[in-house]
Each structure stands twice: as C-alpha cells, then as structure tokens.
C-alpha cells in the first residue's frame, strides 16, 4: 500500500532515453501523444512533474516485515494528465484523471546507476516502461537476463 496520499517530494525534470533521445508530448486531436525523438539543439525539452510516493512492500512477499519500502513515482507532463500503463495493449498512454490516481499511474522507481532510472509498473511487476519503435511501450523484463537492457533505461535532468 502507498503510505499517505501526498507525495514525499516532487521534482520537474526532462526525460530522455539512455541514448539521449528526448521524450516529448504533443496535443493532437484533444489527446496527448508521446514521442521519442532527437531534438533540434535550440528546442526546449519537455518537462515532467515527478511525484514520489513511499510504498510499503507486503511483508508476506518480501520477508522483510515493515522494512521493505519502495519509491513509487507518477509522471505528469501537463496539468491533470498522467502517464499510465495499459497492460492489455502493452502501451504507455497519457490520460486525464482526478486524484486519487489509479494504480496504473504508479511506477516503482529503480536506480540502475547514479544517473539512469527505470520505471516498473505497480500493476504488473517485471514490466517496465521502455522504448519500442520510437514510442514508449511496456516491456517485460527477465530479471536474470535483461535488467540492464538499454531500452528501459532513462535519464532525468532538471
């Protein structure tokens, strides 16, 4: 369960892939589309509001009792819109929604390195936001093999 309803912290950051492509958001036909693209040098990067929440890992699963805390994030590129996992379509979508946010809007934050992060679906452990064909998609990761897979690595820059 997520501890409390308010985030422990928030930050504005631009999101880019491991290969330094930018994640951008465009309003098209009254809905937002998400793109992964090389930005022209003079173009400003889109910012995302990351809200960080503390989540207690169920002790029955972890064996840790109350010790197993995770950090979850929601990502909002514009007011009232949040990234959400669509597990049926294996897609990442932007939806307008009100708080409390649905579980599909929460992602477990992984620090793969000091400057790279990954986002794991709260609703589908082992499934991460990744890059596929210049779009964001949900990618199933085999923990024993592909934990460092570049297509699920992202950089946050303030």
């Amino acid at each position: 369960s997520i501890t409390g309803i308010s985030p422990i912290t928030e930050s504005l950051a631009s999101l880019s892939t491991y290969n330094d492509q930018s994640i951008t958001f465009a309003l098209e036909d009254e809905s937002y589309e998400i793109y992964v693209e090389d930005l022209k040098k003079d173009k400003k990067k889109d910012k995302v509001l990351l809200s960080y929440y503390e989540s207690q890992h169920p002790s029955s699963e972890s064996g840790d009792g109350v010790d197993g805390k995770m950090l979850m994030v929601t990502l909002s590129p514009t007011k009232d819109f949040w990234l959400q996992a669509n597990n049926k379509e294996h897609s990442v979508e932007l939806h307008k929604c009100e708080k409390p946010l649905p579980d599909q809007a929460f992602f477990v934050l992984h620090n793969r390195s000091f400057n790279c992060v990954s986002f794991e679906c709260k609703t589908d452990p082992g499934v991460f936001i990744g890059v596929k064909d210049n779009h964001l998609a949900l990618i199933k990761v085999d923990y024993s093999e592909n934990l460092g897979s570049e297509n699920i690595l992202f950089k946050l820059s303030e």
Epitope: I8, T9, S11, Y52, E54, H57, S62, G63, D64, D67, G68, K69, M70, L71, V108, L109, H110, N111, R112, S113, F114, L147, G148, E158
Partner: antibody
C-alpha cells in the same frame, strides 16, 4: 531485524592491502544498493563506495578510485571492500550501510553496521 | 562536488532548549538531504530523510526543513539523550557528501 556486521579491519602497513566484509541479515539483500562510509578518528563522515542492487555498477570518490573495489555476493548476503595501496589517510572506522528503499539510492542510510577499524601505520 | 557547510560547528544548550542546526550546500539540489545523530563510539543514526521526513522510531521533537541550498534540523525541546554530534548528507549528486558536523553539548 536488519543487521549489518563488518569484519576484516586491523593494522596494515602503508602500501598494504585489506579486505573488509559485511554480513547482512534481516532483509532481502539483493533488492538494495549498499554503501561503505568511513570516519577517521575524531573526524567527520566520508563516502567510500557504493554498489547497485544488481551489482552491475560501482562508484567511488576520487580519494579511493583505482585503489578500492566494492563487490557483493547476493547468495551469501555479503558486501565486500577490497582496499589496496593503503595510505595513512585511509585510517578510519569503516561502516557498511544499506539504502532506504528497494532498488533506489534516495533517502539516506537508515541501517549501519557497528564499524570496523582500519589502521594504516608503519 | 557539492560542499556541505554545517553551522555552528558546536553549540552549548540546556535541556528544554530549542536547537537549530543549518546546512548550506555549495549548489542547489533536489531534496535528497538526510540528517544523522552520532554519539561517541556509536554508529550514526538516521533522523531525517528527504529533507523533512522523520525516520521511523525517531521522536517528533526532531524536524527538518529546507530546499535548494539551505536546510535546517530543529530539535524543539532538547532532551538529555540528544547531546551528540549531528551530520547532514546530500544524496542528489555524486560524490555523496556530508557536512562537517555539529556537536551539541550541555551548557
């Protein structure tokens, strides 16, 4: 109960080597970043090394880079610090610490071992 | 590297006093700022993380605040067991760095 127990400290001559160990228990070891922090006698705290929860990344300050190596053995729930080319200024109590959250570096270090003293002197 | 400058380096106070310790960073960062308490011969103990969140089991007389470059640890009513050395630590940028410490002594 989370426990971190360091061992391997002792007296070593300048230029010598030492390997510190940290035995972890009471938590799922392979879900956490682990870090070594040291404290010279009567001085402040200094970060020494960190390792990712996967073991795939290791990080050091310039003061120990190239001389110290952090590693982990998840099967044994153990953390290690191999210290080579030791200098007098490496004399300190070395603490093994655990991150606050699964998979993450955020939030400080809620768990510390009791520390093990390394003395570098001729 | 981010330098963390703690002030004062030492202070004398009485039981019941309100005590404030500050930590000034050489450059701004997100709020990954922790405060630790250390007693002689003991390991440091995490009091506050994320600049203002109280670690489990820490008395509510301890509080943290601040953002950017200025952070503060406050003890609202000093207790006998609070006489110790306090350190701040930033975790936002590597290398991780600590403040030099503030020793809180009995007046």
């Amino acid at each position: 109960e989370v426990q971190l127990v360091e061992s391997g400290g002792g007296l070593v001559q300048p230029g010598g080597s030492l390997r510190l160990s940290c035995a972890a228990s009471g938590f799922t070891f392979n879900n956490y970043w682990m870090t070594w922090i040291r404290q010279a006698p009567g001085k402040g705290l200094e970060w020494v090394a960190s390792i990712t929860y996967t073991g795939g990344g290791t990080y050091y300050p310039d003061s120990v880079k190239g001389r110290f190596t952090i590693s982990r053995d998840d099967a044994k729930s153990s953390l290690y610090l191999q210290m080579n080319s030791l200098r007098a200024e490496d004399t300190a109590v070395y603490y093994c610490t655990r991150a606050n959250y699964y998979y993450n570096t955020y939030g400080g270090f809620p768990y510390w071992g009791q520390g093990t003293l390394v003395t570098v002197s001729s | 590297d981010i330098q963390m400058t703690q002030s004062p380096s030492s202070l004398s106070a009485s039981v019941g006093d309100r005590v404030t310790i500050t930590c000034l960073a050489s450059e701004g960062f997100s709020n990954d700022l922790a405060w630790y308490q250390q007693k002689p011969g003991k390991s440091p103990k995490l009091l506050i993380y994320a600049a203002s969140r109280l670690q489990d089991g820490v008395p509510s007389r301890f509080s943290g605040s601040g953002s950017g470059t200025d952070f503060t640890l406050t003890i609202s009513s000093l207790q006998p067991e609070d006489f110790a050395t306090y350190f701040c630590q930033q975790g936002s940028k590597y290398p991780l760095t600590f403040g030099g410490g503030t020793k809180v002594e009995i007046k």
